[in-house]
């Protein structure tokens, strides 16, 4: 058993049929010594008396809010949550496996630049009695500070018969050094509590590996005289790190016909313009990637050829 | 650098960008194969990192690029030695057309632009990284290449910025 926060405790249980459970001793936070009784949740049934209460925690029915009283007055509370371990593996019932970029990916994180700011998100099908708490640091043995906000519900989607909820959180490294080569990864820890079930999820990454620039901005076409060619130009996204002579991007320009089956023409360039042939009903798209490190491409910015 | 000494920024930029390409072709991103899960603290913590105080940021380069270039030079020698060591030359053998050979040569090429011509660096340190089993060697290769990708990315940014803003 360990303390998650004040008066909230997590009991770690090996979860299998007829498991013996864990013996837990609760102590009433009071100077009183006599006339103390204990109850669980809203029940008025007295579970025991005295300053301490010893219970055997085996299942969710044994978890909940234990309260000690004296003469009708509440003295203190202890909330017990369960953390299940099945076959040596902690349960992951609350969050959905996003399976990207690999199986058992529950947290996904992205950064728009090298400033030390990043966003993580996760999915669940649970809609109520759900709380999340997020902590982060750079490195684990001698951790350096990363400040995370509160997790918020950021999207709701219907997937077949059930609803899926996306939560996200923004974090910022306290003393970010955008130009340095990271040697210690960022660690993100999410505590999830659904009713009386506790689970924790972690992710470890370098900012450089989760970079995904915003799409190029101000995408424009300029027809070239007496030619089917056009000059496409664009700019670095506002959110990208500066100066651009240091934090450089590379770009992919694509000409795509109306039909998905049509052959795509692609050009790669480090410049912020390119000359391409504009076909009727086609569209021109441009995306960006860090020039020197192969992290994710941005989403496409597109304009129609017409 | 004081005394009017600056590297051939454009040459260095071209070579370092080539190094980035080669480092990724030598070890493409295999579904974000997370090598940190393999407990590599002791193996790749020993490689040089371009750290915050090394002056490799745009302001540091403007003030005095010497310490940054020194750090890059040391890193290039270190990785060149690693790629020439039995970690890469031992079993399992690299494919004949492996980009590691080109990568090794390019590391040497870039380091030569930053040092007197004809240095043959020797070291006692690299063997301490050498694994005994072929599978360990394979894993270590991946880890070294992943570290190298991060290192040369910073070096390439430095030289690109230098070529754009510090060239005479």
């Amino acid at each position: 058993i360990w303390e998650l926060k004040k008066d909230v405790y997590v009991v770690e249980l090996d979860w299998y049929p007829d498991a013996p459970g864990e013996m837990v001793v609760l102590t009433c936070d009071t100077p009183e010594e006599d006339g103390i009784t204990w109850t669980l949740d809203q029940s008025s049934e007295v579970l025991g008396s005295g300053k301490t209460l010893t219970i055997q925690v085996k299942e969710f029915g044994d978890a909940g809010q234990y309260t000690c009283h004296k003469g009708g007055e509440v003295l203190s509370h202890s909330l017990l949550l369960l953390h299940k371990k099945e076959d040596g593996i902690w349960s992951t019932d609350i969050l959905k496996d996003q399976k990207e970029p690999k199986n058992k990916t529950f947290l996904r994180c992205e950064a728009k630049n090298y400033s030390g700011r990043f966003t993580c998100w996760w999915l669940t099908t649970i809609s109520t009695d759900l709380t999340f708490s997020v902590k982060s640091s750079r490195g684990s043995s001698d951790p350096q500070g990363v400040t995370c906000g509160a997790a918020t519900l950021s999207a709701e989607r219907v997937r077949g018969d059930n609803k899926e909820y996306e939560y996200s959180v923004e974090c910022q490294e306290d003393s970010a050094c955008p130009a340095a080569e990271e040697s210690l990864p960022i660690e993100v820890m999410v505590d999830a509590v659904h009713k009386l079930k506790y689970e924790n999820y972690t992710s470890s990454f370098f900012i450089r590996d989760i970079i995904k620039p915003d799409p190029p901005k101000n995408l424009q076409l300029k027809p070239l005289k007496n030619s089917r060619q056009v000059e496409v130009s664009w700019e670095y996204p506002d959110t990208w790190s500066t100066p651009h002579s240091y934090f450089s991007l590379t770009f992919c320009v694509q000409v795509q016909g109306k039909s998905k089956r049509e052959k795509k023409d692609r050009v790669f360039t480090d410049k912020t313009s390119a000359t391409v042939i504009c076909r009727k009903n086609a569209s021109i798209s441009v995306r960006a990637q860090d020039r020197y490190y192969s992290s994710s491409w941005s989403e496409w910015a597109s304009v129609p050829c017409s | 650098v004081p005394g009017g000494s600056s590297p051939a920024w454009t040459q260095c930029q071209q070579l370092s960008q080539k190094l980035c390409t080669l480092a990724w072709s030598a070890h493409p991103l295999v579904g974000h194969m997370d090598l940190r899960e393999e407990g590599d603290e002791e193996t790749t913590n020993d490689v040089p990192h371009i750290q915050c105080g090394d002056g490799c940021d745009p302001q540091g380069l403007r003030d005095n690029s010497q310490f940054c270039l020194q750090r890059i030079h040391q890193g290039l020698i270190f990785y060149e030695k690693l790629l020439g060591s039995d970690i890469f030359t031992g079993e399992p053998s690299l494919l004949p057309d492996s980009p590691v050979g080109q990568l090794h040569a390019s590391l040497l090429g870039l380091s030569q632009l930053l040092q007197p011509e004809g240095h043959h660096w020797e070291t006692q340190q690299i063997p301490s990284l050498s694994p005994s089993q072929p599978w360990q060697r394979l894993l270590l290769r991946f880890k070294i290449l992943r570290s190298l990708q991060a290192f040369v990315a910073v070096a390439a940014r430095v030289f690109a910025h230098g070529a754009a803003t510090l060239s005479p």
Partner: antibody, heavy 120, light 112 residues
């Protein structure tokens, strides 16, 4: 002020080895490479080799390969040079010299010099 | 190895005179990075050498402006515009473009 304080004079028997030291002060030891230079009596200077202190990388003049071994002790900011199997040809003053840094490669801070005399 | 040839071997001068020392290398000292690594050192009697001029023409800190260096490729010159008593000693040219670094044989500047 930058200083390189070298160990005192050495009288060595032919065939023996001798290790001389050079303690750096006034600057960050690992930021600059350390060179060693030989000056025989009434003669010019010969570059022996160089060591990069934070990784122990060494590069030698081929004429001194096997003769000289360069090492550093980062914790005490001290560079060492060992001369092996000495002969009368090795009698000389040996200097440790800091180089000016990357892309400068001049020898800007010279040690006090250590006189090695080989005699039976 | 690059051979550095210094002339003259000995240079007698009167105080206040101009002195000129020549240094020639057996191959070009222009590095592939475009810089030329030719330096001049002065060794006074009983002392360690000291750096005077680096990279052909740059005076090292604290070196008086009566010292100047010039040259390119394989031919280099050190000039002292007005010799003072404290300038006496042996002058060495040296190259660090190629490994091993090499030094000239030295030129002894002495009073006439």
């Amino acid at each position: 002020e930058f200083q390189l304080q070298q160990s005192g004079p050495e009288l060595v028997k032919p065939g023996a080895s001798v290790k001389i030291s050079c303690k750096a002060s006034g600057y960050s030891f690992t930021d600059y490479n350390m060179n060693w230079v030989k000056q025989s009596k009434g003669k010019s200077l010969e570059w022996i080799g160089v060591i990069i202190p934070n990784y122990g990388f060494t590069s030698y003049n081929q004429n001194f390969k096997g003769k000289a071994t360069l090492t550093v002790d980062q914790s005490s900011s001290t560079a060492h040079m060992q001369l092996n199997s000495v002969t009368s040809e090795d009698s000389a003053v040996y200097y440790c010299v800091r180089d000016g840094g990357i892309l400068l490669w001049y020898l800007d801070v010279w040690g006090t010099g250590t006189t090695v005399t080989v005699s039976s | 190895d690059v051979v550095m040839t210094q002339t003259p071997l000995s240079l007698p001068v009167s105080l206040g005179d101009q002195a000129s020392i020549s240094c020639r290398s057996s191959q070009s000292l222009v590095h592939s990075n475009g810089n030329t690594y030719l330096h001049w050192y002065l060794q006074k009697p009983g002392q360690s050498p000291k750096l005077l001029i680096y990279k052909v023409s740059n005076r090292f800190s604290g070196v008086p402006d009566r010292f100047s260096g010039s040259g390119s490729g394989t031919d280099f010159t050190l000039k002292i515009s007005r010799v003072e008593a404290e300038d006496l000693g042996v002058y060495f040219c040296s190259q660090s473009t190629h490994v091993p670094y090499t030094f000239g044989g030295g030129t002894k500047l002495e009073i006439n």
